[in-house]
């Protein structure tokens, strides 16, 4: 058992059918000695009597608030929820499995930019009595600090007949160094409640593998004369890094059809402009990315060739 | 060239060498689905690694006040990872196959190195760590180990030099 | 602590209608009131619910048929066009007090509401 | 999501004991009541945290099983306890929220 935070404690349970559970000593805050009774959640049903109250934790009907009272009057509170362990994994019944970039991913991190701050999102089908609590920090064995807000429900979808919830949180490390080479790595560590169970979830990476950039701005085309070619032109994204000279940016322009089976065009370019042909109801689209780290592509901005 | 003492380097050759550094180091090792190999265990492989870090005035305002610290960094780095590469890591089995990048990545880090050092000159290199694991297996998670932390390296050293031959070059 | 259903009446297919649910003894502030009917013969079935803080959930079946408002001693449930399928009781309960999504322990004796032509 | 309750309906004879099985389509953890109803009355808590006994309710009725298995046991059975049994998950609106089908039990 340890302390989640004041008067809430998380009991560690092997779960299996019979398994013998843990036996918590639960200690009531006050000077009082005699004419102190227990009792859990709602029920006025007195589970012991004395300063402190034994009981063995097996299943989720034996955690909850332990209240201790004397005289009618409440001495004390302690919130018991429970952490599953089954087959040595710890339980992962609370966010889903977001398969992305591999198994086993509940948490998805994304930066648009080296200056330290990144978002992260996780998903969830439970809409009701669900709590998140985010820290995070710089390596784990001499943490450097990284200060996250409160995640806050960023996005609803509907999914068949079940609603599914999105989770996003904001941090920012306290220290960042933009233009060095990251050696320790950003961990963060989600501790959500349901109900009475507690689960935690983790993610490590560095800053430069989580890098998308946002789409280029100001797309624009310019018709060449007497040719169906036009000039493409594009401005680094506002959220990006600067300097552009040492923050620099690689683009890709790709010319499409109406019909997505249409071959597409594509051009990869240094530059923040480029030539290319325009055909009659294509589109223009052109997308971000890291020039020296093949992290991810920022999503496409687009300007029909019309 | 740099010449250590003060001169600055041909700013545009070594953008064009670093860049060309980004691409081999890529293509030697994409990006297999985002094989996480820090959770094999990192600590006693890519510690001992020299990281441009915060102090080594590689960023832009510290390229503007003395470039050479930064570039003794990214010396020593290239002369460690040209060391690393060359090495039964790297030779010995599973081979590498015979169109394989990291030839290329070899003699490319030699060729930067040489850019920023010439002959005659020397800054101070960092010992190489041996590493000479005992199964292919542990050589294959080691080569996969030693280029994610290349590609890291030298995207910081290009950013250096872009930088460099944008705002720095005579 | 006792809750109880009101305005349960034989109104025509589309005609709206409100029910209520007058409660005393306990604050709505500090508990979950639901919604659920049980046609002739049948299950019960719930039709949504809103919490101590106001917030409203319905059962994926309502899309959009009934709408669940509080004042601070009543809670509302509007059945937009009723059809002659919405024709059951309808009962209002309390929740314990422990969570959102909880079970019930204060129950309405519940109002019938008759749809037909 | 969905609960079954099995059987829809028992026949069990006074001072005997009958079992009502309750499955939920996903796991509920221990998210699970069960009520009572007799005709022309609202239900009755009788379990929650599907063991729990509800204030006022005999002893008589127990309810065990956690994930998705739940099992409500009635010994002693007298003719009052002849009604409909549901069982209820509240484990989440969203994710698992809801009525069973319903036991109807009859006492001979």
């Known amino acids: 058992i340890w302390e989640l935070k004041k008067d809430v404690y998380v009991v560690e349970l092997d779960w299996y059918p019979d398994a013998p559970g843990e036996m918590v000593v639960l200690t009531c805050d006050t000077p009082e000695e005699d004419g102190i009774t227990w009792t859990l959640d709602q029920s006025s049903e007195v589970l012991g009597s004395g300063k402190t109250l034994t009981i063995q934790v097996k299943e989720f009907g034996d955690a909850g608030q332990y209240t201790c009272h004397k005289g009618g009057e409440v001495l004390s509170h302690s919130l018991l929820l429970l952490h599953k362990k089954e087959d040595g994994i710890w339980s992962t019944d609370i966010l889903k499995d977001q398969k992305e970039p591999k198994n086993k991913t509940f948490l998805r991190c994304e930066a648009k930019n080296y200056s330290g701050r990144f978002t992260c999102w996780w998903l969830t089908t439970i809409s009701t009595d669900l709590t998140f609590s985010v820290k995070s920090s710089r390596g784990s064995s001499d943490p450097q600090g990284v200060t996250c807000g409160a995640a806050t429900l960023s996005a609803e979808r509907v999914r068949g007949d079940n609603k599914e919830y999105e989770y996003s949180v904001e941090c920012q490390e306290d220290s960042a160094c933009p233009a060095a080479e990251e050696s320790l790595p950003i961990e963060v560590m989600v501790d959500a409640v349901h109900k009475l169970k507690y689960e935690n979830y983790t993610s490590s990476f560095f800053i430069r593998d989580i890098i998308k950039p946002d789409p280029p701005k100001n797309l624009q085309l310019k018709p060449l004369k007497n040719s169906r070619q036009v000039e493409v032109s594009w401005e680094y994204p506002d959220t990006w890094s600067t300097p552009h000279s040492y923050f620099s940016l690689t683009f890709c322009v790709q010319v499409q059809g109406k019909s997505k089976r249409e071959k597409k065009d594509r051009v990869f370019t240094d530059k923040t402009s480029a030539t290319v042909i325009c055909r009659k109801n294509a589109s223009i689209s052109v997308r971000a990315q890291d020039r020296y780290y093949s992290s991810s592509w920022s999503e496409w901005a687009s300007v029909p060739c019309s | 060239r740099a010449v250590p003492g003060g001169s600055s380097p041909a700013w545009t050759q070594c953008q064009q060498l670093s860049q060309k550094l980004c691409t081999l180091a890529w293509s030697a090792h994409p990006l297999v689905g985002h094989m996480d190999l820090r959770e094999e265990g990192d600590e006693e492989t890519t510690n001992d690694v020299p990281h441009i870090q915060c102090g080594d005035g590689c960023d832009p305002q510290g390229l503007r006040d003395n470039s050479q610290f930064c570039l003794q960094r990214i010396h020593q780095g290239l002369i460690f990872y040209e060391k690393l590469l060359g090495s039964d890591i790297f030779t010995g089995e599973p081979s590498l196959l015979p169109d394989s990048p990291v030839g290329q990545l070899h003699a490319s880090l030699l060729g930067l190195s040489q850019l920023l050092q010439p002959e005659g000159h020397h800054w101070e290199t960092q010992q190489i760590p041996s590493l000479s694991p005992s199964q292919p297996w542990q050589r294959l998670l080691l080569r996969f180990k030693i280029l994610r932390s290349l590609q890291a390296f030298v995207a910081v050293a290009a950013r250096v030099f872009a930088h460099g031959a944008a705002t720095l070059s005579p | 602590q006792s809750v109880e259903e009101s305005g349960g009446r034989l109104v025509t297919p589309g005609t709206p209608l409100t029910l209520t649910c007058a409660v005393s003894?306990?604050?709505?502030?500090?508990?979950?009131m639901i919604w659920v009917r049980q046609a002739p013969g049948e299950g019960l079935e719930w039709i949504g619910i809103?919490?101590?803080?106001?917030n409203t959930y319905y059962a994926s079946w309502v899309k959009g048929r009934f709408t669940i408002s509080k004042t601070s001693t009543t809670v509302d449930l509007k059945m937009i066009s009723p059809t002659t399928e919405d024709t059951a009781t309808y009962f209002c309960?309390?929740?314990?007090?422990?969570?959102?999504?909880?079970?019930?322990?204060?129950w309405g004796p519940g109002t019938l509401v008759t749809v037909s032509s | 999501f969905e609960l079954t309750q099995t059987p829809s309906s028992v026949e069990a004879a006074v001072e005997g004991t009958v079992t009502i099985k309750c499955q939920a389509s996903?796991?509920?953890?221990?998210?699970l009541s069960w009520y009572q109803q007799k005709p022309g009355q609202p239900p009755k808590l009788l379990i929650y945290?599907?063991?729990k006994l509800a204030p006022g309710v005999p002893s008589r009725f127990s309810g065990s099983g956690s994930g998705t298995q739940f099992t409500l046991t009635i010994g002693d059975l007298e003719c009052a306890d002849a009604a409909t049994y549901y069982c209820q998950s509240y484990y989440d609106v969203n994710a698992g929220y809801g009525f069973g089908g319903g036991t109807e039990v009859v006492v001979v």
């Open positions: 309960a309390r929740g314990s007090g422990a969570y959102i999504s909880d079970y019930f322990n204060v």
């Open positions: 996903q796991s509920i953890d221990s998210w």
């Open positions: 003894g306990f604050s709505l502030s500090g508990y979950t």
């Open positions: 945290s599907a063991s």
């Open positions: 809103i919490s101590s803080s106001g």
